[in-house]
Interface confidence: low
Amino acid sequence: DTHKSEVAHRFKDLGEEHFKGLVLVAFSQYLQQCPFEEHVKLVNEVTEFAKTCVADESAENCDKSLHTLFGDKLCTVATLRETYGEMADCCAKQEPERNECFLQHKDDNPNLPPLVRPEVDVMCTAFHDNEATFLKKYLYEVARRHPYFYAPELLFFAARYKAAFAECCQAADKAACLLPKLDELRDEGKASSAKQRLKCASLQKFGDRAFKAWAVARLSQKFPKAEFAEVSKLVTDLTKVHTECCHGDLLECADDRADLAKYMCENQDSISSKLKECCDKPLLEKSHCLAEVENDEMPADLPSLAADYVESKDVCKNYAEAKDVFLGMFLYEYARRHPDYSVMLLLRLAKAYEATLEKCCAAADPHECYAKVFDEFQPLVEEPQNLVKQNCELFEQLGEYKFQNALLVRYTKKVPQVSTPTLVEVSRNLGKVGAKCCKLPEAKRMPCAEDYLSVVLNRLCVLHEKTPVSEKVTKCCTESLVNRRPCFSALELDEAYVPKAFNAETFTFHADMCTLSEKEKQVKKQTALVELVKHKPKATKEQLKGVMDNFAAFVEKCCKADDKEACFAEEGPKFVAASQAALA
């Protein structure tokens, strides 16, 4: 399906608004430090050029690839060398190396100020005065902070963002209407970004075979009535979509995602009974809805798996004929029967099955060798089941904040070399698994918990890759995608770690503590907790609890004092001395 002009093809397929939005996202994800106005100028220039190609596909440069056109445009930025340093060297390369170079310079933790939410009236005025600029600013600010955000999904977030302002800026109580919607979009946006980051890591670090295996398992759980051939077709198409988006090919990605949604809605009967309500929606909402659709009911009459995958004498013959297809079918059959398992567990089972066949099909009596393969699955299944049970019990006993603290201590002891901000961020997010998953019925707990933990641990892996400090983290992150979580779970106290020297400055607090939001106060306390554990890795739970209780009491006392700063100056050193004594 070749086109004389790729840019004209995508402009016509996507329409001007989506085209401009996606180009803005692409540029903002590559040049994360560039000012908004610079990006808008670049996008307008690209759009005007695309329009000339729509009018005449054989016009000059219209036959160039999108990477060439976009890369050439990015390389016109005057301050590239000053702002981005060695990234400017990418511009000396030819495609496709230039685009690969840009991708390698995407920064998962850019040094950007946190987004501050202005007063509601200020936002509503800005929205009303120039809606288009307001929405573009949203796309830009999110994209530059989340360089792997799934671009077509970001357009959907922008739609909801716009709808929230359109509705709430007319409301009697604007703030009561708007703020909960913005909080929800922020939280969902962070979750969406993290989920997509795992997909991109899976493709980039472990290849499309790993991503396809993940997709087979997940889609088979969602669409247990669909035939294997149908699931395979969806997996192939989905892999193409995510490969494109993770590779910065956002126009192709959005176009192909729209085609996939169209295909699914035209073939609902052979996919799932749950698609109907999604398919009545407009494009952006439809694609989102299809991605989030609940699992269809399992067919009632599914036979036992043992017949084809254990008892049959043809297992090795079938495996040898087409290994990946046979393993894919095994994964499909297992996953559609087990919506109660996490995708990662299903992938571990498929891996274990593959290892058994590799060993047994070379044995004297293959059938005898693999006859008990399903028994070997039992410990693999019980491990995440027990983990979820124990952690949900702990969460219910402690509540979210103290559960996060327990995880902070646990993970700081495992990998104390990791930076304190990273340990705080990751442990806080790990702790959110409790509220997210523990309230669910038993059959939904494990898929919720373990697949969420995989997303959070991937964040640890991408941050650690930027500045590697721990061989243990590198090992868990790189050896096996499906075994990352068990690898981290199995880590013990790092005996080789030399405790961090005590620094009183780390434990010096001021009156500004008192004006912080509850969340910011928690982060301050949790930062102190990590530093304590780095200083005394062998401190007991009781010792740490005592220090943290004293800390909370000290902060509360000083925040109630008339002269807060004087109180912090006087009580702070006492708290530090008492803490050192308690941990001695």
Epitope: E131, A163, C169, L283
Partner: nanobody
């Protein structure tokens, strides 16, 4: 899908007025914003006016103060009141609608401003 049908176009003298209507049908509950665009012969399609579900509007400088967009949600109809018309306002006027960006379009209605 959303279907849009424009009406109200015609011939008008410079300085005159005209009111365009656009009737929407189909899955209209998803429509958050509606707009008018126009395209003069041999020119690019250009934005004329936009209104959100909540009623906020915006216009380019070329029509500000002369054109007014409004919508009647109960009738699922969009309007464009055009006053002080000029020869350069001659174009086919399109109604457009969508949940975020205008992805559904009408067939257009011709407005000719001439003496």
């Amino acid at each position: 899908q959303v279907q849009l049908v424009e009406s109200g176009g015609g011939l008008v003298q410079p300085g005159g007025s005209l009111r365009l209507s656009c009737a929407a049908s189909g899955s209209i509950e998803s429509i958050n914003r509606m707009a008018w665009y126009r395209q003069a012969p041999g020119k690019q399609r250009e934005f004329v006016a936009r209104i959100s579900k909540g009623g906020s509007t915006n216009y380019p400088d070329s029509v500000k103060g002369r054109f007014t967009i409004s919508r009647d949600n109960s009738k699922n109809t969009l309007y464009l009141q055009m006053n002080s018309l000029r020869a350069e306002d001659t174009a086919v006027y399109y109604c457009a609608a969508g949940p975020v960006w205008e992805q559904f379009w009408g067939q257009g209605t011709l407005v000719t401003v001439s003496s």
